[in-house]
């Protein structure tokens, strides 16, 4: 009984949401990120920005699910192009924006 | 709490056939990836097969490539294991595991594993 | 096919700090996995990502992979660390585990 692959974008979603719902002090110290353009390749992005976040346990596992949807290996200090030049965020907005965009991709039925 | 319960284990002889189920509780079964991994009596461990959530694609070693099925049934939370033509070599104890989430699912890492059953092929 | 190789055996002292290498071709272009297992237990992860713990395991366990070598180390190794480990890499549409290493802590 194959499912359909929203369930596995449901189960990040969900992660982003308790993330943004149980913040109560500043998510990761207020650690700042680069920002992504989230038109294409957005997975692998957003790991690539993360990934640079340590010893924030909040996020931790929204790292971990993210890997599951980039193919290749993320590094730290690793850029994309798709990085937004020279504009960096803090974590807390930058999980609200990647929130926002993968709940339309959710509803636009845009698993890859 | 994740837990994962194998059965189906046991004493078969060479040629014969064993189905093992694995039953998953505690997470959202359907979106995960799941596998499963043998270890033979003294020795490593090995992996057997895939079954990815996010798609339909099933992965196998060459070790049991045409001999051994994987499959799962979702409305059960159930992975189950089809053994045909069980060799000796195939005597060990078998684990289901809890892989990962999304498209590449191997990226992840295997977090949960199951107390595994048994298989035991002599005549 | 692909294979890991680990040294079938390592040995330490209490307190001391136990590394287990896994060789493998270009290993550090893909993610390490590293497994504890007790004997009659199933394994643990205890790294994953190369270097990262998930909740639970004690910060002693450390992990790196770079080159063709992904290392797992134990710092201030304890009896309780007495276990065979094994390392575990994905390629080509394949899960291959290392050969593992039996640690005794003398």
């Known amino acids: 009984s194959p499912v359909p692959p929203s369930t596995a974008l449901k189960e990040l979603i969900e992660e982003l949401v308790n993330i943004t719902q149980n913040q109560k002090a500043p998510l990761c110290n207020g650690s700042m990120v680069w920002s992504i353009n989230l038109t294409a390749g957005v997975y692998c992005a957003a790991l690539e920005s993360l990934i640079n976040v340590s010893g924030c346990s909040a996020i931790e596992k929204t790292q971990r699910m993210l890997n599951g949807f980039c193919p290749h290996k993320v590094s730290a200090g690793q850029f994309s192009s798709l990085r937004v030049r020279d504009t960096k965020i803090e974590v807390a907005q930058f999980v609200k924006d990647l929130l926002v965009h993968l709940k339309k991709l959710f509803r636009e039925g845009q698993f890859n | 709490e994740v837990q994962l319960l194998e059965s189906g284990g046991g004493l078969v002889q060479p040629g014969g056939s064993l189905r093992l189920s694995c039953a998953a509780s505690g997470f959202t079964f359907s979106s995960y990836a799941m596998s499963w991994v043998r270890q033979a009596p003294g020795k490593g461990l090995e992996w057997v097969s895939a079954?990815?959530?996010?798609?339909?694609?099933?992965y196998y070693a060459d070790s049991v490539k045409g001999r051994f099925t994987i499959s799962r049934d979702n409305s059960k939370n159930t992975l189950y294991l089809q053994m045909n033509s069980l060799r000796a070599e195939d005597t060990a104890v078998y684990y289901c595991?809890?892989?990962?989430?999304?498209?590449?699912?191997?990226?992840?890492?295997?977090?949960?594993w199951g107390q595994g059953t048994t298989v035991t092929v002599s005549s | 096919s692909y294979e890991l190789t680990q040294p079938p055996s390592v040995s330490v002292s209490p307190g001391q700090t136990a590394s287990i290498t896994c060789s493998g071709d270009?290993?550090?272009?893909?993610?390490a996995c590293w497994f504890q297992q007790k004997p009659g237990q199933s394994p643990v992860l205890v790294i994953y990502?190369?270097?990262k713990r998930p909740s639970g395991i004690p910060e002693r366990f450390s992990g790196s992979n770079s080159g063709d070598t992904a290392t797992l180390t134990i710092s201030g190794t304890q009896a309780m660390d007495e276990a065979d480990y094994y390392c575990?890499?994905?390629?080509?549409?394949?899960?291959?585990f290392g050969t593992g290493t039996k640690v005794t802590v003398l």
């Open positions: 595991v809890q892989d990962g989430l999304g498209p590449y699912f191997y990226n992840y890492g295997m977090d949960v």
């Open positions: 575990q890499a994905w390629d080509s549409s394949t899960y291959v």
């Open positions: 079954f990815s959530g996010w798609d339909v694609s099933t």
């Open positions: 990502h190369d270097s």
């Open positions: 270009k290993l550090g272009d893909k993610y």
